[in-house]
């Protein structure tokens, strides 16, 4: 099953199942872990392990939980207020240019270079030239809370965030 949320994943939940608690919106918004009813009168809880909402909202749906892809490990499960957190398996990393998939880390550095950084779930090994100390790596920024993405990551804003 695809881990990406598409329009088809977002059908409104017309009726609250017995386990779905209802409460009233506050200033027209429902709290994290809920979505608003079609008539706007109720907040309906998301279904644990199935969908979630992390922020105050007036959405007619909760968002489907991500299923970690093969090659990923689940760091934390989906709750009603937080999506699943997935991370690349040991020995693989998620590259900024292709953040939708985990890639194998290199096993060693090219000739004339030395390793100065290990393989991590978010970066390949880091190599520098023996003499100059110049970097040679596919380094990406630190892992954010969710290490998942749809194809492509913005070059502009993300490069600004430390």
């Amino acid at each position: 099953e695809s881990a990406l949320i598409t329009q088809q994943d977002l059908a409104p939940q017309q009726r609250a199942a017995p386990q779905q608690k209802r409460s009233s919106p506050s200033e027209g918004l429902c709290p994290p872990g809920h979505h608003i009813s079609e008539d706007g009168r109720d907040c309906i809880s998301c279904k644990y392990g199935q969908d979630y909402s992390t922020h105050w909202n007036d959405l007619l749906f909760c968002l489907r939980c991500t299923r970690c892809d093969s090659g990923e490990v689940e760091l934390s499960p989906c709750t009603t207020t937080r999506n699943t957190v997935c991370q690349c398996e040991e020995g693989t990393f998620r590259e900024e240019d292709s953040p939708e998939m985990c890639r194998k880390c290199r096993t060693g550095c090219p000739r004339g270079m030395v390793k100065v950084g290990d393989c991590t779930p978010w970066s390949d090994i880091e190599c520098v030239h023996k003499e100059s100390g110049t970097k040679h790596s596919g380094e990406v920024p630190a892992v954010e809370e969710t290490v998942t993405s749809s194809p492509g990551t913005p070059a502009s804003p993300c490069s600004l965030s430390g």
Epitope: S2, A3, L4, I5, T6, Q7, L10, H35, I36, T54, H55, N57, D58, L59, L60, F61, L63, T66, N83, P99, E144, E145, T146, V147, T148, S149, S150, P151, G152, T153, P154, P157, C158, S161
Partner: nanobody
Framework: EVQLLESGGGLVQPGGSLRLSCAAS????????MSWFRQAPGKGLEFVSY????????AYADSVKGRFTISRDNSKNTLYLQMNSLRAEDTAVYYC?????????????????WGQGTLVTVSS
Amino acid sequence: EVQLLESGGGLVQPGGSLRLSCAASGRALTGYHMSWFRQAPGKGLEFVSYGIWDRAGAAYADSVKGRFTISRDNSKNTLYLQMNSLRAEDTAVYYCAASMAVRTYYSPRSYDSWGQGTLVTVSS
């Protein structure tokens, strides 16, 4: 891929209002996931608000809840962020982001189209 262009930023006094626009070109936005993020000086990208182009409703960060509102104009292919009761801490570059599919709506990595950003300064 869709191209995004933000406008509407500027200098405003605390308590004032601004409306940011995000004009899309390249294709229709039907089914697109749309978000606003912001980046304060020296800080990382922060989620502000999320919605789906042709679906009612939106989600808002705690810091802007009750003050900011997302809206859309289909005829102009434009997403708006109405910002009221602005505070000094709202000072940031505001980015509009879009993607046909997302894994986590509040994660910048989930979006593949970004505008160049518009600067909002709240100061007296």
